[in-house]
Structure formats: C-alpha cells, structure tokens
Interface confidence: medium
Amino acid sequence: KKNPCTAKFQNFCIHGECRYIENLEVVTCNCHQDYFGERCGEKDLLA
C-alpha cells in the first residue's frame, strides 16, 4: 500500500516530518524542536 506521506499528506506537517503508522492506518507528525500539535503548527512560547 502506498505511503500517504509521499502523496496526499506530503504537505500535512508544517514544522515536522510526516509519519505513516501502518498498523493503525494513521498519519502523524514528528515535530521539529519547540513545535507541537497535530500538524506541528504550534510553537512552544517558553522555548
């Protein structure tokens, strides 16, 4: 099965890397430092 991170979700993660967890069939983001949220779009103001 094609990895959705390379197609439909290739621009999903704003400040992070897209990751497809196949065994749960979910797309998630691994955020860059100081960022958080579903799409890594929120910045930690304390950082």
Epitope: I21, N23, L24, E25, V26, T28, C31, G37, E38
Partner: antibody
C-alpha cells in the same frame, strides 16, 4: 464533546453469540483507531481488541482470538464486536475506547476516552 | 505476554496525605522509536476508566497536578501529592508497547 455509547449487551447461554455496538460522536471517527476493553465482575481491566482507522488491521489477545471479531463502519460512526462461542468467563462489562493520538511533539496513542460500558452475562 | 504487577493491592490514606502506587512490568516497555507506552487509568466507583497519565509522566487534559507519574524500563510509579475525597477509586497501570496490551491488577485507594 467526545461521546461513546455501547449497546447490545445482555444474557446469553454458553456457546451463544452476541453483537455489541458502540456509537461515536463529537470527533472524526474515521481518523481514530478504536478498542474494546472488558471488566469481569469485581475484577480488573482486560484488553479485548483494537482496530485500525480503516479496519484493515485488527488485534486480539489469545483469550478471544478466533471467537471475537472487531469491525467498524466509518460512514455510521460505529464500532462493533461480534462475539461467538461465548463462555462463562466472557461475562463482563464491555467498554468501547478511543485510541486517541495525543500530540506532544511526536505522536502517542492511548485509550483517551471510554464509554459507560454494556454488560454481557454468559450463563445457562 | 507482558505481565503488569501493581502494589499495593489496597491503599488506605488520610485526606491531604500523599499516596504512591508501584507498577512493574515483566519486560522493558521502551519502544526504541516512540518512547514508553505506559499509562495510568483512574476508575471511580460505578464509573468507567479515565486516562490519567500517558507516556509514563504526561498528565492528560484536565488532570490535576497533584497526580504525577515517573519511572523507566520496567519500574513505574504513580504519586498523588495530597489525596482528596474525589481520588477514591481503583488505579490501573497499562502497557501498550507490545500486543497484547495488558493492565495491572489495580490498586484500590480508600480514605482511612
């Protein structure tokens, strides 16, 4: 508000079948893996099954494998548990639980919301 | 299967006092890539379980800061800094690093 409402429990004879349902609302059901967990009377919690978002992957402990089948209908926002060849030891309250992604920088999945449960009694 | 062992089985506490629950797993819960899938649930009398702590030490939404989790590898602890009346119930640790997911036997917190 996340809501999970189980139904379908009841009294059934050993060897019988039952189908449990869980109606979900307040979130995008199709985006979440889902689980069933049970609790026998005066006992602890036991994981029963988990299903992936699209239903392609399902997981069971040995205690129910081959007898129970988890499924989902994303169009109806519903989760199901088909229970066959029921035994007295399957008597329990069955909870539907969402496998929620908790975002803290990297993903993390945990059973973040639970329904109130439906009671299954297996007895002759 | 991973066996989760909790102690004590019962924990009578005085209101305002601290409380500590131990959870030990039969093998390491560290997932090389994704951290440690160790969670704590609270089940008040007559209610369904609620997620309290996830990823060993992270409090879930709305959980008071008197609850804290710690530990690593195979040994984990849930602490309540000052027990309140609403904390009465059974607490379960749970691992979801490895299938089958497993729960501890539970620790019943009651007021003396």
């Amino acid at each position: 508000e996340v809501q999970l409402v189980e139904s379908g429990g009841g009294l059934v004879k050993p060897g019988g079948s039952l189908r449990l349902s869980c109606a979900a609302s307040g979130f995008t059901f199709s985006s979440y893996p889902m689980s069933w967990v049970r609790q026998a009377p005066e006992k602890g919690l036991e994981w029963v099954s988990t299903i992936s978002t699209g239903g392609r992957y399902t997981y069971y402990p040995d205690s129910v494998k081959g007898r129970f089948t988890i499924s989902r209908d994303n169009a109806k926002n519903s989760l199901y548990l088909q229970m066959n060849s029921l035994r007295a030891e399957d008597t329990a309250v069955y909870y539907c639980a969402r496998q929620g992604p908790i975002y803290y920088g990297n993903y993390y999945y945990a059973m973040d919301y639970w329904g109130q449960g439906t009671t299954v009694t297996v007895s002759s | 299967d991973i066996v989760m062992t909790q102690s004590p089985l019962s924990l009578p506490v005085t209101l305002g006092d601290p409380a500590s629950i131990s959870c030990r797993s039969s093998q390491s819960l560290v997932d090389g890539e994704d951290g440690t899938y160790l969670n704590w649930f609270q089940q008040r009398p007559g209610q369904s379980p609620k997620l309290l702590i996830y990823k060993v030490s992270e409090r879930f939404d709305g959980v008071p800061d008197r609850f804290s989790g710690s530990g690593s590898g195979t040994d984990f602890t849930l602490k309540i800094s000052r027990v309140e009346a609403e904390d009465v119930g059974v607490y379960y640790c749970s691992q979801s690093t490895h299938v089958p997911y497993t729960f501890g036997g539970g620790t019943k917190v009651e007021i003396k």
